[in-house]
């Protein structure tokens, strides 16, 4: 029988293998960001293209209001790359108190929001200094790992300095997840 295997001492029953094509997955690509208010002590979230060009959402994985919505529980690979563009800066020597971002660095965070839990959870974080770089600089930060996610979880990408995100090409800045 398909999905079953018989052994001399015991019987194991396997669920039929699920085709990869049926699994929830999404790949979102960069759009130009506009200034927005964001929560105190939280970096602003990026918004994304979800259907044009290389971007897609499939099999009940939906994108809405900066969030990827997880449609079923399971282990997901979650990833993002954000490319920052800027120019050499005179880096500030004063460390201002009460600032969520460390001066003179850029940070990307992949965050999980669960409605039943009051605080967002940081799943992944990457930081780079921008003080030692050349005159016109590009700095990609890539993050990716596997997480056990629950149906209804929401994922977003937060960055420390939204005005430095390189919006020009969809292969430079992206965000996605797929069920393993």
């Amino acid at each position: 029988l398909k999905g079953q295997e018989f052994a001399p001492s015991h019987q194991q029953v396997y669920a039929p293998l699920r085709a990869d094509g049926d699994k929830p997955r999404a790949h979102l690509t960069v759009v130009r960001q506009t200034p927005t208010q964001h929560l105190k002590n939280q970096f602003p979230a990026l918004h994304w293209e979800h259907e044009l060009g290389l971007a897609f959402t499939k099999n009940r994985m939906n994108y809405t209001n900066k969030f990827l919505l997880i449609p079923e529980s399971g282990d997901y690979f979650v990833y993002s790359q954000v490319t920052f563009r800027g120019m050499t800066s005179e880096c500030s020597e004063i460390r201002q108190a009460g600032r969520p971002n460390k001066p003179d660095s850029i940070t990307v965070v992949i965050t999980k929001v669960t409605d039943s839990y009051p605080e967002p959870t940081q799943l992944l974080m990457g930081t780079k200094s921008v003080c030692e770089v050349g005159s016109n600089w590009f700095q990609p930060i890539y993050l990716g790992a596997m997480f056990s996610l629950q149906e209804g979880d929401k994922l977003m990408v937060n960055v420390s300095d939204i005005s430095l995100v390189d919006y020009t090409k969809e292969d430079k800045t992206f965000f996605g997840a797929f069920l393993l």
Epitope: P35, M87, E90, N101, D104, S135, L164
Partner: antibody, heavy 116, light 107 residues
């Protein structure tokens, strides 16, 4: 709604200094850059400098020795300080905010007149 | 510094006309070219960024094109509210630099 409002312009003596404020609303200075631009009467727009969300600054090298841009994130205000003013610094001074390459939103500007 | 040369410096046209303004950079600016509109007593408005991308809320009669050092702003059918001064600006290299503007007047 995104707004930038400049204040602090007026009549200044040659050799004096100015400190202009740019109060922003609708976004956070900790994650967005603010540029300063000026326009002298009958002249082209001139970019003065920028303060990035992460705190770094860049200046127009022609004016760098006389300019300081700073900000107070808690007050959502950016400041432009300019020293050793001369008649040719008479201009409308604008603050603007946007992405690394463009200025999406501008203030109405504040007029600075340098004259004795 | 990169020099931005904008032409013409002034232009008379009628409602419904198609208008083209050009901007030339002194070196390649890799498509980081923006266009702005300025009206007396009003805040400057971004129209087009990265050569050809329309800023949110800008009517589709505005379009941009170009590459390398040569760039163009086109208004396909002039409306009464389009009479204003237009500036180009390069965002490729600091210091950012502007063209000196094109004043678009009613014929």
């Amino acid at each position: 709604e995104i707004q930038l409002v400049e204040s602090g312009g007026g009549l200044i003596q040659p050799g004096g200094s100015l400190r202009i404020s740019c109060a922003v609303s609708g976004f956070s200075l900790s994650s967005y850059g603010v540029d300063w631009v000026r326009q002298a009467p009958g002249k082209c727009l001139e970019w003065l400098g920028v303060i990035w969300g992460f705190g770094g600054t860049n200046y127009n090298s022609a004016l760098k020795s006389r300019l300081t841009i700073s900000k107070d994130n808690s007050k959502n205000t950016v400041y432009l300080q300019m020293n050793s003013l001369r008649a040719e610094d008479t201009a409308v001074y604008y603050c603007a905010s946007g992405n690394f390459d463009a200025m999406d939103y501008w203030g109405q500007g504040t007029l600075v007149t340098v004259s004795s | 510094d990169i020099q931005m040369t904008q032409s013409p410096s002034s232009l008379s046209a009628s409602v419904g006309d198609r208008v083209t303004i050009t901007c030339r950079a002194s070196q390649d600016i890799s498509n980081y070219l923006n266009w702005y509109q300025q009206k007396p007593g009003k805040a400057v408005k971004l129209l087009i960024y990265y050569t050809s991308r329309l800023h949110s809320g800008v009517p589709s009669r505005f379009s941009g094109s170009g590459s390398g050092t040569d760039y163009t702003l086109t208004i396909s059918s002039l409306q009464p509210e389009d009479f204003a001064t237009y500036f180009c600006q390069q965002g490729n290299t600091l210091p950012f630099t502007f063209g000196c503007g094109t004043k678009l007047e009613i014929k």
